[in-house]
């Protein structure tokens, strides 16, 4: 699995999407888990509704929400009020019995809030033609990791 990078701004919401084959994964609940270390387990953060037809109902665990479009084949995770400690490697999973298939590996990167004057530096500020409202849209910048890029710092 390639790793897809999703970048969000601290304090704002980040939406992560995980596409999948809706027929292949028919009837399966989904989950969002956080990878603990490069070879460690993936710790469940939140899973979709325990009744599969109701997977479209948003389920929350703390500031993380999950909802599943089982017809279109898109799992959506929302990280609300993104914080620096939310950065890291995650997985979207499809559950069957005690097994879990990885739908997508996701690296969440948290960018400093450009409106936070405490650490302004050379950060971007909205120009005259840009409203502050525009600065608070939900950010979901994503890219795939380039070959050779390592999502975790190498262990010594």
């Amino acid at each position: 699995h390639n790793t897809t990078v999703f970048q969000g701004v601290a304090g704002q919401s980040l939406q992560v999407s995980c596409p999948y084959d809706s027929m292949k994964h028919w009837g399966r609940r989904k989950a969002w888990c956080r990878q603990l270390g490069e070879k460690g387990p993936c710790q469940r953060v939140v899973s979709t509704h325990n009744l599969w037809l109701l997977s479209f109902l948003r389920r929350w665990n703390g500031s993380t929400a999950i909802t599943d479009d089982t017809l279109g084949g898109t799992l959506t995770i929302t990280l609300r009020n993104l914080q620096p400690h939310d950065a890291g490697l995650y997985q979207c999973q499809s559950l069957h019995g005690s097994e879990a298939d990885t739908l997508r590996k996701v690296l969440v990167e948290v960018l400093a809030d450009p409106l936070d004057h405490r650490d302004a530096g050379d950060l971007w500020f909205p120009g005259e033609s840009e409203s502050f409202e525009d600065a608070h849209v939900e950010h979901s910048i994503s890219r795939s990791l380039l070959e050779g890029e390592i999502p975790f710092p190498p262990t010594s």
């Epitope: 028919w26 009837g27 037809l53 109902l57």
Partner: antibody
Framework: QVQLKESGPALVKPTQTLTLTCTFS??????????VSWIRQPPGKALEWLAL???????IYSTSLKTRLTISKDTSKNQVVLTMTNMDPVDTATYYC?????????????WGQGTLVTVSS | DIVLTQPPSVSGAPGQRVTISCSGS????????VSWYQQLPGTAPKLLIY???NRPSGVPDRFSGSKSGTSASLAITGLQAEDEADYYC???????????FGGGTKLTVL
């Protein structure tokens, strides 16, 4: 054995709010995958699903009537209540409650006898 | 709005076999299980078939269900006078995220 019975007014005036109660026995709404739906049928017409409530206070509504419907439950009394606002003569129908089994599929395995509600001034 | 399409009426002589069709789309029948209900005159509907083909206990094996693509069918063999009723199909619709019924089919036993 599983039983459901609807109760409520036989006649409501236009613009009024309808409140219907479904009293059930023989099953628990605390059981995962078990819920209660409301379904209606205007005279001589087809069945129409309205709303469903189940464990964990989860509920879903018909998209076309969502703004007018509220479904709630009292687990201790084994009752499910449906309220429908701004009633109109076209809402005249027999209203049924039915036990609903839902997970990867959904169906109604036990039905109440139904209660006829007429909307007229 | 009626999402699933059924013929308004079908008929057959006693002992014959009749089928009632239920046509939908990929967002409902194409993706989900179908159930069937029988409504005798003046009574509440009764579950006949669930999960496309399964019969609840007490339903005679003269009633059978099937599904292919975006359509489902209810077949009744050895037609009897007491089968005269309205029949409804139902399923989940993944676009509307709700339960949908067919318009119903009136079965007349000649």
């Amino acid at each position: 054995q599983v039983q459901l019975k609807e109760s409520g007014p036989a006649l409501v005036k236009p613009t009024q709010t309808l409140t219907l109660t479904c009293t059930f026995s023989g099953f628990s709404l605390s059981t995962s995958g078990v819920g209660v739906s409301w379904i209606r049928q205007p005279p001589g017409k087809a069945l129409e699903w309205l709303a469903l409530i189940f464990s964990d206070h989860d509920k879903i509504y018909s998209t076309s009537l969502k703004t007018r419907l509220t479904i709630s439950k009292d687990t201790s009394k084994n009752q499910v209540v449906l309220t429908m606002t701004n009633m109109d003569p076209v809402d005249t129908a027999t209203y049924y409650c039915a036990r609903t089994l839902i997970d990867r599929s959904v169906y109604f395995d036990y039905w109440g006898q139904g209660t006829l509600v007429t909307v007229s001034s | 709005d009626i999402v699933l399409t059924q013929p308004p009426s079908v008929s057959g002589a006693p002992g014959q076999r009749v089928t009632i069709s239920c046509s939908g789309s990929s967002s409902n029948i194409g993706h989900h299980y179908v159930s069937w209900y029988q409504q005798l005159p003046g009574t509440a509907p009764k579950l006949l078939i669930y999960d496309n083909t399964n019969r609840p206990s007490g339903v005679p094996d003269r009633f059978s269900g099937s599904k292919s693509g975006t359509s489902a069918s209810l077949a009744i063999t050895g037609l009897q006078a007491e089968d005269e009723a309205d029949y409804y199909c139902a399923t989940w619709d993944g676009l509307m995220n709700s339960i949908v019924f067919g318009g119903g089919t009136k079965l007349t036993v000649l």
